[in-house]
């Protein structure tokens, strides 16, 4: 298995994690995308996902997580607002492409949230809540059940690599199952 790379983010409670997952290829633009947490010894757990098909520049909010898919630049923007210490962990973006396995986007995100207020403009709880007021109608995305751990063996694409997804991938089971996305408290 290829060793996966991680990008570390160290933030304070109340701040916002703002990352971009780079999916590059046009064939993925309309695919449903998800933000997952990976806990030791467990399967990746989907926390939020875009609609299916994914809509361009249309924010989807699930609790404190906001996803925005920018088709024209091949970027999925993920924001986790009002961070809590317990949000610390390893996260990843994936692209759902049933019946194939989800396609993992690199790098994984190692989030470390510590106690204490940084005082950075726009990072306190009040301003975070003001900036990210999104209509509740955007919180109803449903995500497929993620069942395969095999994405962890994929090598990260290099600049000049052909990163089109291989055709010989194992099919997902329970592809018709959907679960309601868990909402952060």
């Amino acid at each position: 298995a290829t060793k996966l790379t991680e990008e570390k983010y160290e933030l304070k409670e109340g701040q916002t994690l703002d990352v971009k997952c780079d999916y590059t290829l046009e064939k993925f633009a309309s695919s449903q995308k998800a933000w997952q947490i990976i806990r030791d010894g467990e399967m990746p757990k989907t926390l939020a996902c875009t609609e299916r098909p994914s809509k361009n520049s249309h924010p989807v909010q699930v609790g404190r997580i906001i996803l925005e898919d920018y088709h024209d630049h091949g970027l999925l923007r993920v924001r986790m607002v009002n961070l809590q210490v317990e949000d610390s962990g390893l996260y990843q973006c994936v692209i759902y492409q049933p019946p194939k396995e989800p396609h993992m986007l690199f790098d994984r995100i190692r989030l470390v949230v510590t106690k204490g207020f940084s005082g950075t403009p726009g990072s306190n709880e009040n301003s975070t809540q003001n900036v990210y007021k999104i209509p509740p109608t955007t919180t109803k995305a449903l995500c497929p059940l993620y069942t395969s751990p095999r994405t962890v063996t994929q090598a990260p694409p290099k600049s000049t690599a052909d990163v089109s997804t291989p055709d010989s991938e194992i099919n997902l089971t329970n592809v018709t199952d959907i679960i309601r996305v868990p909402v952060f408290n």
Partner: antibody, heavy 121, light 111 residues
Framework: EVQLVESGGGLVQPGGSLKLSCAAS????????MHWVRQASGKGLEWVGR??????????YYAASVKGRFTISRDDSKNTAYLQMNSLKTEDTAVYYC????????????WGQGTLVTVSS | DIVLTQSPDSLAVSLGERATINCRAS??????????LHWYQQKPGQPPKLLIY???NLESGVPDRFSGSGSGTDFTLTISSLQAEDVAVYYC?????????FGQGTKLEIK
């Protein structure tokens, strides 16, 4: 190995037409947008236009200097991109390069060797 | 259209010395914190060769004496120690907006 080979260049009179081809190999052609870039002798690079993939309905975009005169197309079954040039002007004289990007709005990692188009009476 | 202006137009640097080329955009070429600005090297009779992509990422196989920096509207290509084979014309290019555009080029020579 990725290869891009342009063909179809030559001498044409002002007002005439010419169709350039770009034969691609070594990658999944249908996955990537294809671009044309030109360079007049002793001058800089000028982006001509691009054609996106089937996922984006083969949308095309052009530089203002060629819009309405040039048309980019592609045949995914033949792994080939085309540049149809009509109403040619002397200022269209240049080496025309076919290039492949690395994905949506990404860099040009691969270039052909170019084909020379000369517009002259 | 986004206009890219390179400076200087030409540059003569001694072997082993640092060479710096600037590229200024008429408007930001960033989307979020990604800069869609790339650098190419072109030698006579050859197609351009990608050096740096998205402002600061070194293309595979390119010597690490090349580096890129900047964001928004101001970008820099630096060659830390000029080698004879670096004599070429260098171009910046933006892909943040259609139409894509190139800078006018900077000719690098040995002093």
């Amino acid at each position: 190995e990725v290869q891009l080979v342009e063909s179809g260049g030559g001498l044409v009179q002002p007002g005439g037409s010419l169709k350039l081809s770009c034969a691609a190999s070594g990658f999944t052609f249908s996955t990537y947008a294809m671009h044309w870039v030109r360079q007049a002798s002793g001058k800089g690079l000028e982006w001509v236009g691009r054609i996106r993939t089937k996922s984006s309905n083969y949308a095309t975009y052009y530089a203002a200097s060629v819009k309405g005169r040039f048309t980019i197309s592609r045949d995914d079954s033949k792994n080939t991109a085309y540049l149809q040039m009509n109403s040619l002007k002397t200022e269209d004289t240049a080496v025309y390069y076919c290039t492949r990007d690395m994905g949506i709005r990404r860099q040009f990692a691969y270039w052909g060797q170019g084909t020379l188009v000369t517009v002259s009476s | 259209d986004i206009v890219l202006t390179q400076s200087p137009d030409s540059l003569a640097v001694s072997l082993g010395e640092r060479a710096t080329i600037n590229c200024r955009a008429s408007e930001s070429v960033d989307t979020f914190d990604y800069s869609f600005l790339h650098w190419y090297q072109q030698k006579p009779g050859q197609p351009p060769k990608l050096l740096i992509y998205r402002a600061s990422n070194l293309e595979s196989g390119v010597p690490d004496r090349f580096s890129g920096s900047g964001s928004g509207t101001d970008f820099t290509l630096t060659i830390s120690s000029l080698q004879a084979e670096d004599v070429a014309v260098y171009y910046c290019q933006q892909s943040n907006e259609d139409p894509y555009t190139f800078g006018q080029g900077t000719k690098l020579e040995i002093k």
